[in-house]
């Protein structure tokens, strides 16, 4: 699909000179200027003509007010000044502050726990299928198939450490070579970035907040995808990761060491273990080709058991299977031998909710998935609200300055690298890149952290998770030490290579530009965020996997034309931006294609229609929920009353392209202005068209 012209003004810095523009570009959009204005080659710039951009893919919508949506919002302090408060007011303020801080920690704790439960839920729903992906060894020798298996498995189990441990076991037992494991590790790296993207979806209520949150989350996705796009072919051609890690292993004689301290797990486990406990070995057994494991439940029932080793007479297929003739005999029909049989005797049951329910894994998975997403969403809303009310005025200024300001002049370039170290350190502490990046997402959304600062923090998080894996590998038993260490090092050097590709030179920081572009599209068409998530993390990997099953010729036959088409679109896009004069008039824009091929507008109309029908049915339910939320949150500008208007009334009302304000539960007190007069509140009642963008969520 060609890029969308309605979103083409990708201007990171409107004040800079750009080739093809007559002068410094004003932030005032073209439609507000005179239509007769000409560019450098004398051609009149029509009202609809769009200005060029730095990036071929960054697609940014126009902003009538002339404000840059990526500017961090001013978190104004609307409360009474400290000096103006009396003693009682000051005491109350302190108590409120402490209370808010405790609540914030509480919601943050629940947020992290719900992420853990979400991972368990995904494993219950798709863990066995994920394990089966691994059991097809012939496919995994194909690097592209390996990559998508890594993506799919990690998305399904919501844990790169689970997929990594399966890979380690398979390498250790020679079911997989390190060479074949590298693309899977790369895929696992991509798969792990879905978590914070899901978290970002929860902030879809406020357009600008969502724009920032979604961009902040997808900067991780783009970094991983772009790294793979460059490094997978490089690895397939040169095997540099395999060679480099072999070299490291041979140079340094690694000894078994201590595992990384599980600081976060120590706090969250007591709670999450009361909800669900899983037997991760089942997925591993399926991956290793154990057919019996297919019928086992992932839900852990027994937590305490003792192991008895007893000598037992067991039958063997033939005398060749005997350890020695001394330990072999026959009863005339079968051959018998003595074997040490390990029998597990269960002593105590686990203490989680589902221990006594004989529900299938899928049912428990769906229940937990629903509950964890609701809790995750609720916690996120509350965190955003609390942060919004805490981060005001001076506090906000200090925090924003601390987080987003660079070092003084000669050392400005070091700031990003420090952020990488901070990201790595924080991830090492919490032992999960998903937790760290997911916790960062709402902060990006409300404007505490800029995308430019979130990017190195995310890269650091990628490094942090690999250092954790290296320590875990060092703590693994002797037989798996080498393979687990080599895989952990491959993961580490892959991320280092990615950082070297997409960070040091500001020009190469493509993930930021791409994420901002996607943020803009998703802010305008919120359904696109869901489409992106499904398309990039499920549809594309599943399609590639399906084609891999059909064999190399089919994969190449289908893949190459698609890649060539994408490259053609990309080249054409670049030419349209950089030097449109060399192109024929027809190719200077995408108007030669049908509208649905180069614009999201027709698609939006279709989705609006679908969601309108859906909205009619669940409208009254929405209104009740909205009112309850308003009561709980104490929102001043709740708009539930006109939720269920007649279609006629809706059409009569003029369409206003006001940025969609969050309804009810999504209302962010920190970000929205106080509603002084009711009239203003009434104007903000959304038309069905505008509202349709939120209904996806």
């Amino acid at each position: 699909m060609a890029p969308w012209p309605e979103l083409e003004n990708a201007q990171p810095n409107p004040g800079k000179f750009i080739e093809g523009a007559s002068g410094p570009q004003s932030s005032i959009p073209a439609k507000d200027k005179e239509a007769s204005k000409t560019n450098d080659n004398g051609t009149p710039v029509a009202k609809t003509e769009l200005l060029p951009s730095y990036s071929a893919l960054v697609l940014i919508e126009e902003h009538p007010e002339g404000t840059d949506p990526w500017d961090l919002p001013e978190l104004q302090d609307t409360g009474i000044k400290w000096s103006e408060r009396d003693t009682k007011g000051k005491t109350l303020c302190i108590f409120q502050g402490v209370g808010k801080f405790i609540l914030l920690l509480g919601f943050l704790y629940l947020f992290v726990c719900s992420l853990d439960v979400l991972s368990s839920a995904f494993q219950l729903v798709g863990g066995k299928v994920a394990g089966q992906f691994f059991s097809n060894n012939s496919i995994m020798s194909n690097p592209v198939a390996g990559l998508v298996i890594g993506v799919l498995v990690t998305v399904m189990v919501q844990s790169s450490s689970t997929s990594s441990s399966i890979i380690v076991s398979m390498v250790a037992s020679s079911l997989l070579t390190v060479r074949a494991a590298i693309p899977i590790i790369m895929g696992a790296n991509i798969g792990t970035s879905i978590t914070n993207t899901i978290v970002a979806l929860m902030q879809a209520g406020d357009r600008n907040e969502f724009r920032r949150a979604f961009a902040g989350a997808t900067v991780h996705d783009f970094f991983n995808w772009l790294s793979v796009f460059v490094l997978l072919p490089l690895e397939a051609a040169t095997h540099y990761l395999e060679i480099l890690t072999n070299l490291v292993l041979e140079t340094f004689k690694f000894q078994n060491g201590e595992d990384a301290p599980d600081i976060l797990k120590v706090i969250t486990d007591p709670f999450t273990k009361l909800i669900i406990q899983l037997d991760k070995k089942v997925i591993q057994q399926i991956a290793m080709g154990d057919s019996a494991a297919q019928n086992k439940s992932l839900i852990k029932i027994w937590c305490k058991s003792i192991t008895n080793v007893t000598e037992m007479n067991v039958t063997v297929p033939s005398t060749d299977n005997c350890t020695s003739p001394s330990y072999c005999w026959t009863d005339g029909i079968q051959t018998w031998t003595i074997q040490n049989v390990t029998q597990k005797e269960n002593i105590a049951k686990c203490q989680h909710i589902f221990v006594n329910f004989s529900l299938p894994d899928l049912a428990v998975g769906i229940i937990l998935l629903t509950v964890s997403l609701v809790v995750l969403c609720g916690c996120l809303i509350m965190i955003v609200k609390l942060l919004g009310s805490v981060l005001r005025g001076q506090v906000a200024t200090v925090i924003k300055k601390t987080l987003n300001t660079d070092f003084p002049f000669p050392f400005a370039w070091l700031t990003g690298y420090l952020a990488i170290l901070v990201g790595a350190g924080m991830t090492f502490i919490v032992q999960s890149s998903s937790v760290f990046t997911s916790a960062m997402t709402p902060l990006i959304g409300i404007g505490v952290i800029s995308i430019e600062r979130a990017y190195p923090l995310t890269l650091g998080s990628n490094i942090g998770t690999t250092t954790t894996a290296i320590l875990a590998a060092l703590a693994s038993p002797g037989n798996t030490l080498r393979s687990s260490l080599q895989i952990a090092l491959c993961h580490f050097f892959f991320n280092i290579s990615g950082i070297l590709l997409w960070y040091p030179i500001p020009f190469t920081r493509l993930p930021i530009r791409l994420a901002k572009g996607l943020g803009n599209i998703s802010a305008k068409y919120r359904w696109f965020a869901v489409f992106y998530l499904i398309f990039f993390f499920f549809v594309t990997p599943l399609t590639v996997f399906g084609l891999s099953l059909a064999g190399w010729p089919v994969l190449v036959g289908v893949g190459v034309p698609i890649i060539l088409l994408l490259l053609l679109v990309l080249c054409l896009r670049m030419l349209q931006f950089r030097c449109p004069r060399i192109l024929p008039l027809k190719l200077r824009d995408w108007n030669f294609l049908p509208l649905w091929m180069h614009s999201l507008k027709p698609w939006d109309n279709v989705i609006s229609l679908a969601t309108t029908c859906f909205q009619r049915r669940c409208c009254c339910c929405c209104r009740v929920c909205c009112r309850v939320c308003c009561m709980v949150c104490g929102c001043k500008c709740c708009r539930c009353s006109k939720c269920c208007r007649d279609q006629g009334e809706e059409e009569e009302e003029k369409e206003q392209d006001i940025p969609v304000k969050a309804s009810g539960a999504f209302d962010n007190a920190a970000m929205s202005k106080e509603c002084q007069d009711e009239g203003k509140g009434q104007v903000e009642v959304l038309s069905m068209k505008a509202l349709s963008n939120t209904t996806v969520f």
């Epitope: 003739p325 330990y327 026959t330 009863d331 005339g332 018998w336």
Partner: antibody, heavy 120, light 107 residues
Framework: QVQLVQSGAEVVKPGASVKMSCKTS????????MHWVRQAPGQGLEWIGA????????SYNQKFKGRVTLTADKSTSTAYMELSSLRSEDTAVYYC?????????????WGQGTLVTVSS | DIQMTQSPSSLSASVGDRVTITCKAS??????VAWYQQKPGKVPKLLIY???TRHTGVPSRFSGSGSGTDFTLTISSLQPEDVATYYC?????????FGGGTKVEIK
Amino acid sequence: QVQLVQSGAEVVKPGASVKMSCKTSGYTFITYNMHWVRQAPGQGLEWIGAIYPGSGDTSYNQKFKGRVTLTADKSTSTAYMELSSLRSEDTAVYYCSISTIITTGAVDYWGQGTLVTVSS
Amino acid sequence: DIQMTQSPSSLSASVGDRVTITCKASQDVGTAVAWYQQKPGKVPKLLIYWTSTRHTGVPSRFSGSGSGTDFTLTISSLQPEDVATYYCQQYSRIPLTFGGGTKVEIK
């Protein structure tokens, strides 16, 4: 008590076949392996083969393979041995026996024996 | 097939004597060896299995020993009723094989 009652003596011509039976009682027929052992006059013991009545699994001494067939009828708790292409050296007492010592080939209950005489 | 070679083929001893019968296997059979007693005109009777385990009802004067390839049946004090032919048997491999037998007589 465990009892194994074998069919009566047989006189057969060389090249012919003989089918003898072993009716059991006093135990669960399908539980133990049934062995067949022969003893030529004034000679030692020779193992022919065994059958597990529960599944019908059989095992034969290569020396008799192709000539001997062991079967078991669970309904009557009777085991059968058929020996074909008889030769004069097949003249012997044929015993059916069971091993109640699970997993071993040591037989502890024997039938009274069936004398087969191969003579023209 | 595993050959079981018994020696002597016959022996004569006085009542109360200690009698030893040996059995040699052509290859390692572990301890999967049984001993049988067959009195003239009777069916064989199991005496010992697993080289040294006495079967139910077998007098304590009968004992077995050995492992691998060399095995021994010992009658600590020969009694008149012990007159019989004694057979060793291996059940380590199929086919099960018996020794040639040792005929024990009273002097």
